[in-house]
Protein backbone atom coordinates (compact mmCIF):
# COMPACT_ATOMS: atom_id res chain seq x y z
CA UNK A 1 0.00 0.00 0.00
CA UNK A 2 0.99 3.47 -0.28
CA UNK A 3 -0.72 5.58 1.70
CA UNK A 4 -2.96 5.04 5.05
CA UNK A 5 -6.50 4.35 2.98
CA UNK A 6 -8.71 4.75 5.54
CA UNK A 7 -8.03 8.72 5.96
CA UNK A 8 -5.33 8.93 3.26
CA UNK A 9 -2.52 10.21 4.73
CA UNK A 10 1.12 9.26 4.76
CA UNK A 11 2.29 7.90 7.86
CA UNK A 12 5.92 8.07 6.93
CA UNK A 13 5.95 11.40 5.66
CA UNK A 14 3.64 14.52 7.31
CA UNK A 15 5.12 16.88 4.32
CA UNK A 16 3.01 15.37 2.19
CA UNK A 17 -0.19 16.33 0.26
CA UNK A 18 -2.77 13.41 -0.54
CA UNK A 19 -6.11 12.98 -1.80
CA UNK A 20 -7.57 9.30 -3.63
CA UNK A 21 -7.05 9.97 -6.85
CA UNK A 22 -4.59 6.76 -7.32
CA UNK A 23 -5.60 3.68 -9.61
CA UNK A 24 -8.80 2.91 -8.55
CA UNK A 25 -9.29 5.46 -6.06
CA UNK A 26 -6.47 4.84 -4.43
CA UNK A 27 -4.92 7.31 -1.72
CA UNK A 28 -2.02 8.56 -3.45
CA UNK A 29 0.44 10.86 -1.74
CA UNK A 30 3.35 13.26 -3.13
CA UNK A 31 5.74 15.39 -1.69
CA UNK A 32 5.67 19.20 -0.80
CA UNK A 33 7.96 21.30 -3.12
CA UNK A 34 8.73 18.36 -5.45
CA UNK A 35 5.12 17.17 -5.87
CA UNK A 36 6.62 14.01 -6.39
CA UNK A 37 4.66 10.50 -5.66
CA UNK A 38 6.06 8.38 -2.17
CA UNK A 39 6.15 5.10 -1.30
CA UNK A 40 4.06 5.80 2.19
CA UNK A 41 5.25 2.03 3.29
CA UNK A 42 9.12 3.57 3.60
CA UNK A 43 11.11 6.45 4.09
CA UNK A 44 10.79 9.01 2.25
CA UNK A 45 14.26 10.03 0.58
CA UNK A 46 16.19 12.98 2.33
CA UNK A 47 16.04 14.57 -0.56
CA UNK A 48 12.29 15.08 -1.34
CA UNK A 49 12.59 16.15 2.55
CA UNK A 50 14.90 18.70 2.25
CA UNK A 51 12.80 19.99 -0.65
CA UNK A 52 9.76 19.97 0.83
CA UNK A 53 11.25 21.85 3.74
CA UNK A 54 11.44 25.24 2.84
CA UNK A 55 12.98 26.74 5.69
CA UNK A 56 14.77 26.08 9.11
CA UNK A 57 17.90 27.63 10.84
CA UNK A 58 21.18 26.29 9.85
CA UNK A 59 22.66 24.00 11.99
CA UNK A 60 26.39 24.58 11.83
CA UNK A 61 28.43 21.40 13.55
CA UNK A 62 31.89 21.64 14.63
CA UNK A 63 33.64 18.59 16.07
CA UNK A 64 36.87 16.76 16.11
CA UNK A 65 36.40 14.35 12.94
CA UNK A 66 36.81 10.45 13.28
CA UNK A 67 38.33 10.31 9.91
CA UNK A 68 40.40 12.48 7.66
CA UNK A 69 37.50 11.98 4.96
CA UNK A 70 34.45 12.01 7.49
CA UNK A 71 32.47 14.76 6.21
CA UNK A 72 29.95 16.79 8.66
CA UNK A 73 27.02 18.75 7.20
CA UNK A 74 28.43 21.88 7.79
CA UNK A 75 26.46 23.97 5.00
CA UNK A 76 23.16 23.33 6.70
CA UNK A 77 19.66 23.45 4.78
CA UNK A 78 19.61 24.12 1.12
CA UNK A 79 16.74 23.51 -1.52
CA UNK A 80 18.05 20.66 -3.38
CA UNK A 81 17.76 19.26 -6.93
CA UNK A 82 16.15 15.76 -6.70
CA UNK A 83 16.38 12.78 -9.26
CA UNK A 84 13.50 11.10 -10.55
CA UNK A 85 13.94 8.71 -8.36
CA UNK A 86 14.15 11.01 -5.31
CA UNK A 87 17.75 11.25 -5.41
CA UNK A 88 20.31 14.12 -4.73
CA UNK A 89 21.42 14.77 -7.95
CA UNK A 90 25.54 14.96 -7.88
CA UNK A 91 25.66 18.13 -8.73
CA UNK A 92 23.69 21.32 -6.72
CA UNK A 93 23.66 24.65 -7.26
CA UNK A 94 21.98 27.53 -6.01
CA UNK A 95 20.68 31.04 -7.52
CA UNK A 96 23.97 32.76 -7.64
CA UNK A 97 25.10 30.06 -9.95
CA UNK A 98 27.27 29.13 -7.19
CA UNK A 99 27.96 25.45 -7.80
CA UNK A 100 28.97 22.22 -5.74
CA UNK A 101 29.28 18.64 -5.49
CA UNK A 102 27.17 16.06 -2.68
CA UNK A 103 27.33 12.72 -1.91
CA UNK A 104 23.76 10.43 -1.35
CA UNK A 105 22.92 12.02 1.70
CA UNK A 106 23.38 15.77 0.06
CA UNK A 107 26.42 16.63 2.21
CA UNK A 108 28.68 18.77 0.22
CA UNK A 109 32.11 16.70 -0.87
CA UNK A 110 33.77 19.53 -3.08
CA UNK A 111 34.73 23.05 -3.11
CA UNK A 112 32.24 25.27 -4.63
CA UNK A 113 32.79 26.36 -7.90
CA UNK A 114 30.66 27.98 -10.55
CA UNK A 115 28.07 26.73 -13.41
CA UNK A 116 31.30 24.67 -15.37
CA UNK A 117 31.94 22.22 -12.36
CA UNK A 118 31.18 18.94 -12.64
CA UNK A 119 30.07 16.07 -10.63
CA UNK A 120 30.56 12.68 -12.85
CA UNK A 121 28.45 10.19 -10.41
CA UNK A 122 26.69 10.45 -7.30
CA UNK A 123 28.99 9.26 -4.80
CA UNK A 124 27.52 6.65 -2.08
CA UNK A 125 27.85 7.25 1.97
CA UNK A 126 28.38 3.84 2.87
CA UNK A 127 29.71 4.42 6.33
CA UNK A 128 27.71 6.86 8.90
CA UNK A 129 28.37 7.55 12.41
CA UNK A 130 25.83 9.00 14.71
CA UNK A 131 27.42 10.58 17.76
CA UNK A 132 25.11 10.75 20.68
CA UNK A 133 25.30 12.53 24.00
CA UNK A 134 22.87 11.41 26.52
CA UNK A 135 21.92 13.36 29.56
CA UNK A 136 22.87 12.60 33.26
CA UNK A 137 21.41 9.03 34.40
CA UNK A 138 21.42 7.37 37.54
CA UNK A 139 23.90 4.80 36.51
CA UNK A 140 25.34 3.99 32.99
CA UNK A 141 22.71 2.48 30.21
CA UNK A 142 24.03 -1.26 29.66
CA UNK A 143 25.63 -1.66 26.83
CA UNK A 144 23.76 -5.02 25.52
CA UNK A 145 20.31 -3.28 26.17
CA UNK A 146 21.34 -0.36 24.48
CA UNK A 147 22.75 -1.92 21.48
CA UNK A 148 19.30 -4.39 21.47
CA UNK A 149 16.69 -1.17 21.89
CA UNK A 150 18.93 0.79 19.19
CA UNK A 151 18.49 -1.82 16.88
CA UNK A 152 15.12 -2.48 17.23
CA UNK A 153 13.87 1.25 17.18
CA UNK A 154 15.92 1.18 13.26
CA UNK A 155 14.29 -2.03 12.28
CA UNK A 156 10.62 -0.87 13.35
CA UNK A 157 10.24 2.44 13.20
CA UNK A 158 12.76 3.29 10.17
CA UNK A 159 12.71 -0.27 8.61
CA UNK A 160 15.99 -0.62 8.56
CA UNK A 161 17.56 -4.18 8.81
CA UNK A 162 19.50 -4.63 11.55
CA UNK A 163 22.45 -5.80 9.15
CA UNK A 164 23.04 -2.42 8.25
CA UNK A 165 23.60 -1.30 12.15
CA UNK A 166 27.36 -2.43 12.39
CA UNK A 167 27.96 -1.76 16.06
CA UNK A 168 26.57 0.49 18.67
CA UNK A 169 29.42 1.48 20.65
CA UNK A 170 28.79 2.73 24.20
CA UNK A 171 31.36 5.26 26.71
CA UNK A 172 28.96 6.86 29.07
CA UNK A 173 27.43 9.39 28.46
CA UNK A 174 28.57 9.33 24.41
CA UNK A 175 26.47 6.60 22.43
CA UNK A 176 27.64 6.24 18.79
CA UNK A 177 25.79 4.20 16.17
CA UNK A 178 27.60 3.12 13.25
CA UNK A 179 25.52 2.54 9.92
CA UNK A 180 26.83 0.90 6.94
CA UNK A 181 25.76 0.09 3.80
CA UNK A 182 27.87 -1.15 0.75
CA UNK A 183 26.07 -0.30 -2.53
CA UNK A 184 26.65 -4.06 -3.45
CA UNK A 185 24.35 -4.95 0.13
CA UNK A 186 21.89 -2.69 -0.75
CA UNK A 187 18.65 -4.72 -2.11
CA UNK A 188 16.38 -3.02 -3.76
CA UNK A 189 13.36 -2.72 -1.01
CA UNK A 190 16.04 -2.19 1.86
CA UNK A 191 15.59 1.34 3.15
CA UNK A 192 18.89 3.77 2.83
CA UNK A 193 21.26 4.14 5.32
CA UNK A 194 21.64 7.83 4.94
CA UNK A 195 17.31 8.28 4.74
CA UNK A 196 16.99 6.30 7.69
CA UNK A 197 19.78 8.51 9.53
CA UNK A 198 17.90 11.46 8.75
CA UNK A 199 14.61 10.34 9.56
CA UNK A 200 16.33 9.38 13.52
CA UNK A 201 18.20 13.19 13.42
CA UNK A 202 14.75 14.59 13.56
CA UNK A 203 13.39 12.34 16.10
CA UNK A 204 16.07 12.68 18.16
CA UNK A 205 15.32 16.79 17.71
CA UNK A 206 11.79 16.62 18.04
CA UNK A 207 11.22 17.18 15.03
CA UNK A 208 9.58 13.96 13.60
CA UNK A 209 8.82 13.44 10.15
CA UNK A 210 6.12 10.80 11.16
CA UNK A 211 2.51 11.59 10.35
CA UNK A 212 0.30 12.15 13.71
CA UNK A 213 2.62 9.75 15.80
CA UNK A 214 4.22 10.68 18.95
CA UNK A 215 7.47 12.23 18.99
CA UNK A 216 9.97 9.56 19.27
CA UNK A 217 9.96 7.88 23.18
CA UNK A 218 13.30 6.26 23.49
CA UNK A 219 13.71 3.72 26.77
CA UNK A 220 16.20 1.30 27.56
CA UNK A 221 14.46 -1.08 29.85
CA UNK A 222 12.00 1.63 31.12
CA UNK A 223 14.83 4.49 31.84
CA UNK A 224 14.50 7.09 29.31
CA UNK A 225 17.56 7.68 26.74
CA UNK A 226 17.22 11.71 26.57
CA UNK A 227 19.97 12.48 24.00
CA UNK A 228 21.67 16.29 24.46
CA UNK A 229 23.52 16.36 21.84
CA UNK A 230 23.62 14.69 18.18
CA UNK A 231 26.93 14.62 15.43
CA UNK A 232 26.50 13.25 12.38
CA UNK A 233 29.41 11.85 10.45
CA UNK A 234 29.62 10.76 6.64
CA UNK A 235 31.72 8.68 5.11
CA UNK A 236 31.82 7.79 1.35
CA UNK A 237 32.98 4.90 -0.73
CA UNK A 238 35.33 7.68 -2.62
CA UNK A 239 36.99 10.40 -0.46
CA UNK A 240 36.12 14.06 -0.90
CA UNK A 241 37.35 16.10 -2.81
CA UNK A 242 38.58 19.46 -1.00
CA UNK A 243 40.87 21.68 -1.52
CA UNK A 244 44.06 22.39 1.02
CA UNK A 245 42.91 25.62 1.50
CA UNK A 246 39.79 24.53 3.30
CA UNK A 247 41.90 22.34 5.52
CA UNK A 248 43.99 25.34 7.35
CA UNK B 1 5.60 -11.46 30.85
CA UNK B 2 5.36 -12.30 27.02
CA UNK B 3 2.87 -14.02 25.86
CA UNK B 4 1.58 -14.84 22.51
CA UNK B 5 -1.72 -16.92 22.53
CA UNK B 6 -3.55 -18.34 19.23
CA UNK B 7 -6.51 -19.08 18.15
CA UNK B 8 -7.83 -23.00 17.95
CA UNK B 9 -7.32 -25.78 15.70
CA UNK B 10 -9.23 -25.44 12.01
CA UNK B 11 -10.48 -28.05 9.70
CA UNK B 12 -11.08 -26.71 6.36
CA UNK B 13 -12.01 -28.28 3.06
CA UNK B 14 -9.67 -27.83 -0.45
CA UNK B 15 -10.16 -24.31 -1.97
CA UNK B 16 -11.31 -22.64 1.51
CA UNK B 17 -10.01 -20.10 3.42
CA UNK B 18 -8.76 -19.94 7.25
CA UNK B 19 -7.68 -17.42 9.66
CA UNK B 20 -5.62 -17.55 12.77
CA UNK B 21 -5.41 -14.94 15.31
CA UNK B 22 -2.39 -14.03 17.62
CA UNK B 23 -3.03 -12.52 20.91
CA UNK B 24 0.34 -10.40 22.16
CA UNK B 25 0.71 -9.58 25.85
CA UNK B 26 3.35 -8.10 28.14
CA UNK B 27 4.78 -5.88 26.06
CA UNK B 28 4.04 -2.86 23.74
CA UNK B 29 2.51 -4.30 20.42
CA UNK B 30 3.61 -1.87 17.79
CA UNK B 31 7.19 -2.08 19.48
CA UNK B 32 7.71 -5.84 17.69
CA UNK B 33 6.93 -7.04 14.47
CA UNK B 34 4.86 -10.45 14.39
CA UNK B 35 6.51 -13.18 11.72
CA UNK B 36 4.60 -16.50 10.66
CA UNK B 37 6.61 -19.70 10.29
CA UNK B 38 4.41 -23.13 9.37
CA UNK B 39 5.40 -26.48 10.07
CA UNK B 40 4.16 -29.50 8.49
CA UNK B 41 3.43 -32.82 10.09
CA UNK B 42 6.85 -34.45 10.61
CA UNK B 43 8.29 -31.95 9.16
CA UNK B 44 10.78 -28.73 9.56
CA UNK B 45 9.96 -25.07 9.90
CA UNK B 46 9.26 -22.61 7.19
CA UNK B 47 8.99 -18.90 7.55
CA UNK B 48 5.63 -17.12 5.91
CA UNK B 49 6.25 -13.52 6.36
CA UNK B 50 6.21 -11.08 8.99
CA UNK B 51 4.03 -7.80 9.20
CA UNK B 52 4.61 -4.87 10.84
CA UNK B 53 3.04 -3.89 13.95
CA UNK B 54 4.05 -0.46 13.80
CA UNK B 55 3.27 0.48 10.19
CA UNK B 56 0.67 -2.84 9.63
CA UNK B 57 2.36 -3.64 6.60
CA UNK B 58 3.50 -6.89 5.36
CA UNK B 59 6.41 -8.73 3.63
CA UNK B 60 5.64 -12.26 2.35
CA UNK B 61 7.42 -15.43 1.38
CA UNK B 62 7.49 -15.37 -2.20
CA UNK B 63 6.22 -18.77 -1.95
CA UNK B 64 2.88 -17.80 -0.25
CA UNK B 65 2.82 -14.28 -1.96
CA UNK B 66 -0.96 -13.66 -3.60
CA UNK B 67 -2.28 -16.37 -1.46
CA UNK B 68 -1.64 -15.08 2.13
CA UNK B 69 -2.76 -11.78 3.95
CA UNK B 70 -1.23 -11.07 7.28
CA UNK B 71 -3.12 -8.03 9.28
CA UNK B 72 -2.84 -6.44 12.79
CA UNK B 73 -5.65 -4.86 14.90
CA UNK B 74 -3.48 -2.75 17.26
CA UNK B 75 -6.80 -1.60 19.76
CA UNK B 76 -6.55 -5.96 20.58
CA UNK B 77 -2.81 -6.49 19.96
CA UNK B 78 -4.02 -8.88 17.95
CA UNK B 79 -1.84 -10.58 14.36
CA UNK B 80 -3.58 -12.38 11.85
CA UNK B 81 -2.45 -14.32 9.04
CA UNK B 82 -5.07 -15.60 6.29
CA UNK B 83 -4.18 -17.92 3.81
CA UNK B 84 -6.55 -18.51 1.31
CA UNK B 85 -7.36 -21.52 -1.71
CA UNK B 86 -6.38 -24.07 1.17
CA UNK B 87 -4.50 -27.47 -0.43
CA UNK B 88 -3.93 -30.90 1.58
CA UNK B 89 -0.15 -29.86 1.89
CA UNK B 90 -1.41 -26.84 3.78
CA UNK B 91 -1.92 -28.87 6.65
CA UNK B 92 0.47 -27.64 9.30
CA UNK B 93 0.61 -26.38 12.98
CA UNK B 94 0.85 -22.44 11.90
CA UNK B 95 3.36 -20.49 14.11
CA UNK B 96 3.10 -16.95 15.19
CA UNK B 97 6.51 -15.54 16.53
CA UNK B 98 7.60 -12.37 17.96
CA UNK B 99 10.89 -10.47 16.62
CA UNK B 100 13.83 -10.15 18.86
CA UNK B 101 15.44 -6.97 19.75
CA UNK B 102 18.28 -6.92 17.86
CA UNK B 103 19.15 -9.89 15.41
CA UNK B 104 15.99 -10.55 13.89
CA UNK B 105 15.75 -14.06 16.02
CA UNK B 106 12.24 -15.09 17.05
CA UNK B 107 12.50 -14.63 20.46
CA UNK B 108 8.72 -15.71 21.69
CA UNK B 109 6.35 -17.66 20.09
CA UNK B 110 2.43 -18.83 20.00
CA UNK B 111 1.45 -22.27 20.78
CA UNK B 112 0.53 -22.66 17.39
CA UNK B 113 -2.57 -23.70 15.61
CA UNK B 114 -3.09 -26.33 14.03
CA UNK B 115 -5.20 -26.16 10.49
CA UNK B 116 -5.81 -29.50 8.77
CA UNK B 117 -7.31 -29.11 5.17
CA UNK B 118 -9.13 -32.64 4.22
CA UNK B 119 -11.94 -33.34 1.56
CA UNK C 1 17.15 -18.29 -1.31
CA UNK C 2 19.56 -18.69 1.54
CA UNK C 3 19.77 -22.57 1.54
CA UNK C 4 20.69 -24.42 4.93
CA UNK C 5 22.47 -27.57 5.49
CA UNK C 6 22.10 -28.99 8.90
CA UNK C 7 24.05 -32.09 9.80
CA UNK C 8 23.21 -34.64 11.01
CA UNK C 9 19.77 -34.91 11.00
CA UNK C 10 19.40 -37.54 13.71
CA UNK C 11 21.62 -38.24 16.63
CA UNK C 12 21.98 -40.93 19.48
CA UNK C 13 23.99 -39.54 22.43
CA UNK C 14 24.19 -40.45 25.74
CA UNK C 15 23.47 -38.50 29.34
CA UNK C 16 27.03 -36.39 30.12
CA UNK C 17 28.15 -36.92 26.25
CA UNK C 18 29.36 -33.56 24.26
CA UNK C 19 26.83 -33.29 21.11
CA UNK C 20 27.73 -30.65 18.06
CA UNK C 21 25.30 -30.11 15.42
CA UNK C 22 26.53 -28.40 12.40
CA UNK C 23 24.78 -25.25 10.04
CA UNK C 24 26.32 -24.94 6.73
CA UNK C 25 24.65 -21.74 4.98
CA UNK C 26 24.83 -21.26 0.87
CA UNK C 27 25.85 -17.53 1.23
CA UNK C 28 27.58 -15.56 4.39
CA UNK C 29 25.10 -14.71 7.06
CA UNK C 30 28.05 -12.34 8.18
CA UNK C 31 27.46 -8.60 8.49
CA UNK C 32 30.43 -6.15 9.69
CA UNK C 33 30.85 -9.10 12.08
CA UNK C 34 27.16 -9.38 13.20
CA UNK C 35 26.12 -13.27 12.39
CA UNK C 36 22.46 -13.25 11.28
CA UNK C 37 22.16 -16.92 12.46
CA UNK C 38 19.99 -18.18 15.44
CA UNK C 39 19.74 -21.45 16.99
CA UNK C 40 16.35 -23.17 18.29
CA UNK C 41 14.90 -26.10 20.52
CA UNK C 42 11.66 -27.83 19.77
CA UNK C 43 10.08 -30.49 21.56
CA UNK C 44 7.43 -32.73 20.21
CA UNK C 45 4.14 -31.08 20.53
CA UNK C 46 5.52 -27.57 21.29
CA UNK C 47 6.30 -24.12 19.55
CA UNK C 48 10.14 -23.73 19.34
CA UNK C 49 12.43 -22.00 21.85
CA UNK C 50 15.07 -19.44 20.91
CA UNK C 51 18.58 -20.87 22.64
CA UNK C 52 21.28 -19.11 20.36
CA UNK C 53 21.32 -16.13 18.76
CA UNK C 54 23.41 -13.98 16.70
CA UNK C 55 25.73 -17.47 16.39
CA UNK C 56 26.82 -17.14 20.00
CA UNK C 57 24.51 -15.34 22.29
CA UNK C 58 22.98 -17.07 24.69
CA UNK C 59 19.29 -16.52 25.28
CA UNK C 60 18.37 -15.13 28.06
CA UNK C 61 17.21 -17.87 30.51
CA UNK C 62 18.81 -20.67 28.99
CA UNK C 63 21.59 -22.95 30.63
CA UNK C 64 25.22 -22.45 29.84
CA UNK C 65 25.73 -25.97 28.25
CA UNK C 66 24.10 -24.41 25.31
CA UNK C 67 26.60 -23.02 23.11
CA UNK C 68 27.21 -21.27 19.76
CA UNK C 69 30.26 -20.54 17.33
CA UNK C 70 31.03 -19.77 13.63
CA UNK C 71 30.92 -16.85 11.59
CA UNK C 72 30.03 -16.40 7.32
CA UNK C 73 29.16 -20.10 6.53
CA UNK C 74 29.83 -22.31 8.81
CA UNK C 75 28.25 -22.64 12.20
CA UNK C 76 28.29 -25.14 15.37
CA UNK C 77 25.97 -25.39 17.91
CA UNK C 78 26.83 -27.20 21.10
CA UNK C 79 25.85 -29.12 24.17
CA UNK C 80 28.60 -29.51 26.50
CA UNK C 81 26.92 -31.92 28.81
CA UNK C 82 23.54 -33.60 27.37
CA UNK C 83 21.27 -33.83 29.85
CA UNK C 84 17.60 -36.69 29.47
CA UNK C 85 15.33 -32.99 29.29
CA UNK C 86 17.21 -32.12 26.52
CA UNK C 87 15.71 -34.42 23.55
CA UNK C 88 14.28 -32.83 21.14
CA UNK C 89 15.17 -31.48 17.46
CA UNK C 90 17.64 -28.53 17.18
CA UNK C 91 17.00 -26.13 13.85
CA UNK C 92 19.44 -23.31 12.96
CA UNK C 93 17.96 -20.33 11.19
CA UNK C 94 19.13 -17.84 9.35
CA UNK C 95 17.53 -13.37 9.29
CA UNK C 96 20.50 -12.17 6.91
CA UNK C 97 17.79 -12.21 3.89
CA UNK C 98 13.84 -12.21 2.90
CA UNK C 99 12.78 -15.21 3.00
CA UNK C 100 14.33 -16.25 6.19
CA UNK C 101 15.46 -20.18 6.26
CA UNK C 102 15.76 -22.82 8.57
CA UNK C 103 18.06 -26.31 8.39
CA UNK C 104 16.49 -29.04 8.41
CA UNK C 105 16.86 -29.87 11.91
CA UNK C 106 18.34 -32.29 14.29
CA UNK C 107 16.20 -34.97 16.10
CA UNK C 108 18.43 -35.75 19.21
CA UNK C 109 17.83 -39.19 20.79
CA UNK C 110 19.36 -40.33 24.95
CA UNK C 111 21.11 -43.65 23.84
Known amino acids: HTAAQDNCTCPTNKMTVCSPDGPGGRCQCRALGSGMAVDCSTLTSKCLLLKARMSAPKNARTLVRPSEHALVDNDGLYDPDCDPEGRFKARQCNQTSVCWCVNSVGVRRTDKGDLSLRCDELVRTHHILIDLRHRPTAGAFNHSDLDAELRRLFRERYRLHPKFVAAVHYEQPTIQIELRQNTSQKAAGDVDIGDAAYYFERDIKGESLFQGRGGLDLRVRGEPLQVERTLIYYLDEIPPKFSMKRLT | QVQLVQSGAEVKKPGASVKVSCKAS????????INWVRQAPGQGLEWMGVISTYYGDASYNQKFKGRVTMTTDTSTSTAYMELRSLRSDDTAVYYC????????????WGQGTMVTVSS | DIQMTQSPSSLSASVGDRVTITCRVS??????????MHWYQQKPGKAPKLLIY???NLESGVPSRFSGSGSGTDFTFTISSLQPEDIATYYCQQSYEDPYTFGGGTKLEIK
Open chain 2, 97 to 108: ARYGDGYNQFDY
Open chain 3, 54 to 56: RAS
Open chain 3, 27 to 36: ESVDSYGNNF
Open chain 2, 26 to 33: GYTFTDYS
